[in-house]
Every structure is written in structure tokens, then in C-alpha cells.
């Protein structure tokens, strides 16, 4: 006991790498190795005591000349052999550290997904805000400037840009007006903005019979039904999204009118499909 090998012959096979090493030497717990650490460190004397396990009380490793220290320059030549069941191979907190790391990773991923996951941009057409009417008697033409109100809600945890709003108005399945607004606004996280837009419309030509209706003296309210169509284009993270809505709205073509928001939706009116 107490002998140490200064050199081990190199073998190509792991299975017989320790041929010639006596069981006594194996019990000593140290084996000479020609294999160097990957990082090639050759620092000061190691501070870890090497101990021989004999089944009885452990004694200081004689290979270290009883100092419990590895002489400088031998750290990369000596290999410790210890039982697999040794607790030092299984520090108690390893599982805890691993689980904590996994938990933190999952938590961070979850938070990233939660905050960055694209949520809906809600567009709600509120209704007609105002309608200003004028006539061309000679051409039997009606001009209606219709101002509409939209509520746009950003349900995301980041800002979105309302790139453009395109709107058109139909009467009797015929497009009578179009409008487009560009670079409108930026809506902050979890914020809502109300946007007004005006569509100039013209009721004329094959619908010029409407001039008679809209100017009829015997009628108090000259309500007509118009189909309002609106498309909102929003962008975030370079991604573009379009939300469209269409709604029948009631407009008085006989006089200038300002509506309570949503009021024009419930008036008793019609839309012929000529």
C-alpha cells in the first residue's frame, strides 16, 4: 500500500486502460494519468485533500507525501477514483438548481409569450356623427358629407400604428363615396382611441329620383339607409393587419344633422335595392 504509479502505458481501448494497475493501487484512490485538463490550467497547489478509503477509517493519501496536498505540476497527472455512491458526487442541491433554472427559463419564456403574443386590435364602428347636405337643383344631385366615428382598441402590451383607414359608402348597392386616411395615429399598449373620418358622398345620375325624396316638403325626416364600409390597417413588429366592418346607417338627406353617437343606427328608415 502507498505505492503510486508514476506512469501508465497508453492504450487505445478504455476497457484495458488500467491493466497492470493493482487493486491496491485502485484503493489508494490515485492513478497517474498522461491526460491533461482541457483548460490546461497549471496553477497553485490544489487545496483539496486526497483520502484513501479502506473500508475502515480513512487515512491521508500517502501519494501526497502525507501533506494532503498535491505537489505543484501533478494536478493534471493524478486521477481520483472514488465510489459511485460517494455523496460528493451528488451534491444535495443539484436537482434544486436544475429545477430552479428550468423554472426561471419557463417563467421568462412564459412572460415573453404573454407580453409579446399578438392580441386582437378591436375596431368598433360607433356610427354617424354628423351629416351635412347640399343640393344641385339643376343636376338633381345630393351632396352628403358624412362624418363617422370609430373606436380602435389595442389589446396588446406594445404600441400599434394605425397606418390607414379606407372607407366607402353604398346606397342601393352603388358606391356613392370613398375616403382614405393615411398615417393616422399610434395607439399605446392596452389603449383605445376614437377616430373620426369624413366621407364625401354624391347621390346623382341613376339615383336622381332621390332628389325628389330628400326635398319632399311633406316629409319631416328624410331618412335613407346607407351601407358604411370601413377597413382599418394596423402595423406592429413589421406585421400588417386589416380589420373590416360594414353596417347599415341611417342618414337624413333633407337637412344638416348632428347625431348622438349610435343614434343613427336605430332610426326607422329604409334602403331600396334599385
Amino acid at each position: 500500500m502507498g505505492k503510486s504509479l508514476s506512469h501508465l502505458p497508453l492504450h487505445s481501448s478504455k476497457e484495458d486502460a488500467y491493466d497492470g494497475v493493482t487493486s491496491e493501487n485502485m484503493r489508494n484512490g490515485l492513478v497517474n494519468s498522461e491526460v491533461h485538463n482541457e483548460d490546461g490550467r497549471n496553477g497553485d497547489v490544489s487545496q483539496f485533500p486526497y483520502v484513501e478509503f479502506t473500508g475502515r477509517d480513512s487515512v491521508t493519501c500517502p501519494t501526497c507525501q502525507g501533506t494532503g496536498r498535491i505537489p505543484r505540476g501533478q494536478e493534471n497527472q493524478l486521477v481520483a477514483l472514488i465510489p459511485y455512491s460517494d455523496q460528493r458526487l451528488r451534491p444535495r442541491r443539484t436537482k434544486l438548481y436544475v429545477m430552479a433554472s428550468v423554472f426561471v427559463c419557463l417563467l421568462l419564456s412564459g412572460l415573453a409569450v404573454f407580453f409579446l403574443f399578438p392580441r386582437s386590435i378591436d375596431v368598433k364602428y360607433i356610427g354617424v356623427k354628423s351629416a351635412y347636405v347640399s343640393y344641385d337643383v339643376q343636376k338633381r344631385t345630393i351632396y352628403l358629407n358624412i362624418t363617422n366615428t370609430l373606436n380602435i382598441t389595442n389589446n396588446n402590451y406594445y404600441s400599434v400604428e394605425v397606418e390607414n383607414i379606407t372607407a366607402q359608402v353604398q346606397f342601393s348597392k352603388t358606391v356613392i363615396g370613398k375616403a382614405r386616411l393615411n398615417n393616422i395615429t399610434i395607439i399605446g399598449p392596452l389603449d383605445m382611441k376614437q377616430i373620426d373620418y369624413t366621407v364625401p358622398t354624391v347621390i346623382a345620375e341613376e339615383m336622381s329620383y332621390m332628389y325628389d325624396f330628400c326635398t319632399l316638403i311633406s316629409i319631416k325626416v328624410h331618412n335613407i339607409v346607407l351601407m358604411m364600409q370601413v377597413t382599418v390597417t394596423t402595423t406592429y413588429f413589421g406585421h400588417s393587419e386589416q380589420i373590416s366592418q360594414e353596417r347599415y346607417q341611417y342618414v337624413d338627406c333633407g337637412r344638416n344633422t348632428t347625431y348622438q353617437l349610435g343614434q343613427s343606427e336605430y332610426l326607422n328608415v329604409l334602403q331600396p335595392q334599385q
Epitope: 338633381r140 345620375e205 336622381s208 325628389d212 325624396f213 326607422n268 328608415v269 329604409l270 331600396p272 335595392q273
Partner: antibody, heavy 117, light 107 residues
């Protein structure tokens, strides 16, 4: 005042065709669409189709496609209804009327068509 | 096609009474509805257009009401000249269709 004058009664044989007219006066002819209706004896009213003199736009009830044809003579402000391949089911009074927003405000006196051999 | 269901089919009333005729559309027609009166051997005559507006020359005892799918024509204090057949008609989407008619006769 607005008037729609329809042509007189017709007695025709089965398989033949008939063309009736509706002459408009008292307003700008190209402004209002002209509607055509059928009323069988003692029965309700059925819409056949309409014609808009402004742009010659014609619309038909699916039931009368292939049976009815609407044409116009703008110089005389007259719209024509042509009925082909007549059968006894086509015996009825045919009305023309002027379209207005939410109703037909002026009606012709009607043209009676009798299909008999 | 939009179906128009008119009721009642016939009505026997006395002069001076008030009557209400109803018309139900199979879908929303947004008040695009006309009421007509037709007397024997005559052409129909427009009474009410756009559900609530009285046509020129129609007596004020006639009135139209309703919205969506339910509409009615009310005649207050019936006169002898009011007897005949009444039709409703929608003008919302082609084809326009008429109700089956309500025959109003003297009791």
C-alpha cells in the same frame, strides 16, 4: 301631372307573343325606374321586373326570366313589356308603375291579356 | 326572396270603426315598405311609402308604422270609400314582393 298610359287589352292565342306599352308623361322620363306587375284574375300582385331609362338597367324576377322582356323607346318616353310563348297562365292584368323611394307612386290603368285558342 | 305575410286575409267592419292591417317580412326590410289600396276594377294606389310617409292626397286617417320585420297600416274612422283590398310590398331587395292582400268589406 304624372301619368302612365298603357296600351289596350289583348286577346292572343297560346304559343304566341304579345307586346304592351307604358307611356310616361308629366316628369323627366330618365329620372325614375319603371316597374311591371302581374295580377291574375282575383289574385294578388306579382313583380315582373323593372327598367331604368337613365342607363337602360333592367332587372327581372327569376320567375319571369325567359318569359318577359323589357325594352324602351326614349324618344317617346315609352317602356315595353314583351311576353313570349303565352299559355293560359299568362292571362292577367299587367300594370306598369313609377318607382319612388319606398313605394310605387304612380300606376298605369293596366293592360288585360287573355290567352285563348 | 323575402316573403311578406299579410294578415288578416279579410276583414268585415262597419263605417266609423278603426282597423289595423299587419304585414310581416321574412327578414329585416329597413322600413322599405309601401301600402296600396285597390278597388274593384281599378289600379292599385299608393297610400304609404317608406313605411310611415303618407303619399300625396291620402287622407290623414291613414297611418303607417313599424320597423325591422313588423309593419302595420291603421285606418281611423273608416269611410265608405276605404273599402277594397289592401296590399303591402317591400322594396328592400330584388325581387320586390307583395303581401297576399287584405280584403276590407262593409259589415
Amino acid at each position: 301631372q304624372v301619368q302612365l298610359q298603357q296600351s289596350g287589352a289583348e286577346l292572343v292565342k297560346p304559343g304566341a307573343s304579345v307586346k304592351m306599352s307604358c307611356k310616361a308623361s308629366g316628369y323627366t322620363f330618365t329620372t325614375f325606374p319603371i316597374e311591371w306587375m302581374k295580377q291574375s284574375h282575383g289574385k294578388g300582385l306579382e313583380w315582373i321586373g323593372n327598367f331604368h331609362p337613365y342607363n337602360d338597367d333592367t332587372k327581372y324576377n327569376e320567375k319571369f326570366k325567359g318569359k318577359a322582356t323589357l325594352t324602351v323607346d326614349k324618344s317617346s318616353s315609352t317602356v315595353y313589356l314583351d311576353l313570349s310563348r303565352l299559355t293560359s297562365d299568362d292571362s292577367a292584368v299587367y300594370y306598369c308603375a313609377r318607382y319612388f323611394y319606398g313605394g310605387m307612386d304612380y300606376w298605369g290603368q293596366g293592360t288585360s291579356v287573355t290567352v285563348s285558342s | 326572396d323575402i316573403q311578406m305575410t299579410q294578415s288578416p286575409a279579410s276583414l268585415s267592419v262597419s263605417v266609423g270603426e278603426t282597423v289595423t292591417i299587419t304585414c310581416r317580412a321574412s327578414e329585416n326590410i329597413y322600413s322599405s315598405l309601401g301600402w296600396y289600396q285597390q278597388k274593384q276594377g281599378e289600379s292599385p294606389q299608393l297610400l304609404v311609402f317608406a313605411a310611415t310617409n303618407l303619399a300625396d292626397g291620402v287622407p290623414s286617417r291613414f297611418s303607417g308604422s313599424g320597423s325591422g320585420t313588423q309593419y302595420s297600416l291603421k285606418i281611423n274612422s273608416l269611410q265608405s270609400e276605404d273599402f277594397g283590398t289592401y296590399y303591402c310590398q317591400h322594396l328592400w331587395s330584388i325581387p320586390w314582393t307583395f303581401g297576399g292582400g287584405t280584403r276590407l268589406e262593409i259589415k
